[in-house]
């Protein structure tokens, strides 16, 4: 006969390691008992546990708790163990000597290798800010062994570099992602990938692009300067821009105060019926943490007396 | 710093069996495994297996098996990989390199040249 | 086993160029698993990327790795008359361990 095992076993810290040892022999033969032993444990082996055939499982007072046998059925050649919640320390080879009758002893040696999952964490760089050159928008760490793989996915245009540090048996990496802000980005997601053997699937971290930028301003309502007459009601001015953050508004008469009556409701101007006293320059001010514009109109309320009258006099001139 | 130093070149019959050297330097040589790998002339790297320097433990490629024999001595920090029954085709430089999952230090190689 | 084959098996560039070298595995391997190394004439391989994308120590940032799953990438960026050699990538996450036959990176 001979004995099945594996010449590595991995497992993830904190979960159980099958440790394998099967017998394979001719028909008749039985086994005895099954001892195992760290089998690298300095001044010679470390005694794990004994299966017995008759007696069941012993396990040795350093792994008491720590091994067991795995779950029925049970196969009466099968002498494999489980070693319950692995640590970094019991990375190292163990051996499983098998007594059987008639063919005697046999013994085989696995190596133990633990795999520590990473728990990364992402690091927003400074505030981006529309204008900047290439700036760091988030670095992403993670700390593993063997060494994690650190990429990012996002449909923002930048660059990535990365760099590593081992210790023994185990890194820590950290990748870097680099963009130059522009407005597009903002609300973008860029998300962090960590892969590793000792996880199930890659971990995501996401974090969400926040570009401060202040857009040109405008004012909307002037398009027909024909409806700006006295009389007419309901007329208003609307500034327009956008930002991150949002920005605020304000109005202001450059040629005097604003005229009483005048409302103000944050990027609106409203009028009540027009006389030509509403006639001016008109400013919209838009600001917000990153910076403000400007953007001025002239409103000339046309009196169609007045204008009339000029009529008749341009007639009489001709 | 880290340093691994590998026995001269050495010229054997067929038939016969060599013995490679590899002293570890400028780290604890109990800590980490040592690989022996091989490379033909103009050929890649061949993997041949693993010693723990800590307990003596090994496992062996199983093109391998039956004729390479790795062992050490951790009073010396040295590290020994013998292979017997040699032929023509072990010609090739042998490499021991420390493993620290992926091979972060290698010596300096050792030319076996097996010839009648 | 898991064997690694490499492409091109010979790279032909001049310096300053881009080399960008590949390694098919024949069987998924954890990226965390994947190393390249250089070899230069009557040296011994040196170890350039680890975990599939991390340069090790003192190698200098224009060597990059990249891919996952069965694809893998080695980019040499700006290539320096001292990065012509033969690369390897190897697997250490399964037994045997196992090498890619090598691509030779030589001057145009």
């Known amino acids: 006969g001979e004995l099945e095992t594996s010449d590595v076993v991995t497992v993830v810290l904190g979960q159980d390691a099958k440790l394998p040892c099967f017998y394979r022999g001719d028909s008749g033969e039985q086994v005895g008992q099954v001892a195992w032993a760290r089998a690298d444990a300095g001044e010679g082996a470390q005694e794990l546990a004994l299966l017995h055939s008759k007696y069941g499982l012993h396990v040795s007072p350093a792994y008491e708790g720590r091994v067991e046998q795995p779950p029925p059925p049970r196969n009466p050649l099968d002498g494999s163990v489980l070693l319950r919640n692995a640590v970094q320390a019991d990375e190292g080879e163990y051996e499983c000597r098998v007594s059987t009758f008639p063919a005697g002893s046999f013994q085989a040696r696995l190596r133990l290798r633990v795999l520590v999952p990473p728990l990364p964490s992402l690091n927003p760089g400074p505030a981006l800010e529309e204008g900047q050159g290439l700036t760091l928008a988030a670095s992403c760490t993670a700390e593993g062994s063997p060494a994690p793989s650190v990429t990012w996915d996002t449909e923002v245009k930048g660059t990535t570099s990365s760099r590593s540090f081992k210790h023994s048996r185990s890194a820590a990496v950290t990748s870097e992602f680099h963009l130059v802000p522009s407005r597009s980005m903002n609300g973008q997601p860029l998300t962090c990938v960590v892969s590793h053997p000792g996880l199930l699937q890659d971990q995501r971290i996401t974090h969400i692009l926040h570009v401060s930028f202040l857009a040109e301003a405008s004012v909307r309502g002037l398009e027909d300067q024909n409806l700006w007459h006295v009389g007419r009601e309901g007329a208003m001015l609307k500034c327009l821009s956008e930002g991150q953050p949002p920005p605020s508004y304000n109005w202001t008469r450059l040629d005097g105060p604003l005229p009483s009556g005048v409302r103000v409701d944050g990027d609106t101007l409203g009028f009540p019926p027009l006389t030509t006293e509403h006639s001016g320059i008109y400013v919209c001010h838009v600001s917000n943490e990153f910076s403000s514009r400007d953007s001025q109109v002239t409103v000339d309320v046309l009196d169609p007396q007045e204008d009339s009258g000029k009529q008749v006099d341009l007639v009489s001139a001709s | 710093q880290v340093q691994l130093v590998q026995s001269g070149a050495q010229v054997k019959k067929p038939g016969a069996s060599v013995k490679v050297s590899c002293k570890a330097s400028g780290y604890t040589f109990t800590g980490y495994y040592i690989h022996w790998v091989r490379q033909a002339p103009g050929q890649g790297l061949e993997w041949m297996g693993w010693i723990n320097p800590n307990s003596g433990g090994t496992n062996y490629a199983q093109k391998f098996q039956g004729r390479v024999t790795m062992t050490r001595d951790t009073s010396i920090s040295t590290a020994y990989m013998e292979l017997s029954r040699l032929r023509s085709d072990d010609t090739a430089v042998y490499f021991c390199?420390?493993?620290?999952?992926?091979?972060?230090?290698w010596g300096q190689g050792t030319l076996v040249t097996v010839s009648s | 086993e898991i064997v690694l084959t490499q492409s091109p098996g010979t790279l032909s560039l001049s310096p300053g160029e881009r080399a960008t070298l590949s390694c098919r595995t024949s069987q998924s391997v954890s990226s965390s698993y994947l190393a390249w190394y250089q070899q230069k004439p009557g040296q011994a391989p040196r170890l350039l990327i680890y975990g599939a994308s991390n340069r090790a120590t003192d190698i200098p940032d224009r060597f990059s790795g990249s891919g996952s799953g069965t694809d893998f990438t080695l980019t040499i960026n700006r290539l320096e008359p001292e990065d012509f050699a033969v690369y390897y990538c190897?697997?250490?996450?399964?037994?045997?361990?196992?090498f890619g036959q090598g691509t030779r990176l030589e001057i145009k």
């Open positions: 190897q697997q250490y996450g399964s037994s045997p361990i196992t």
């Open positions: 390199a420390r493993e620290d999952w992926d091979f972060d230090y």
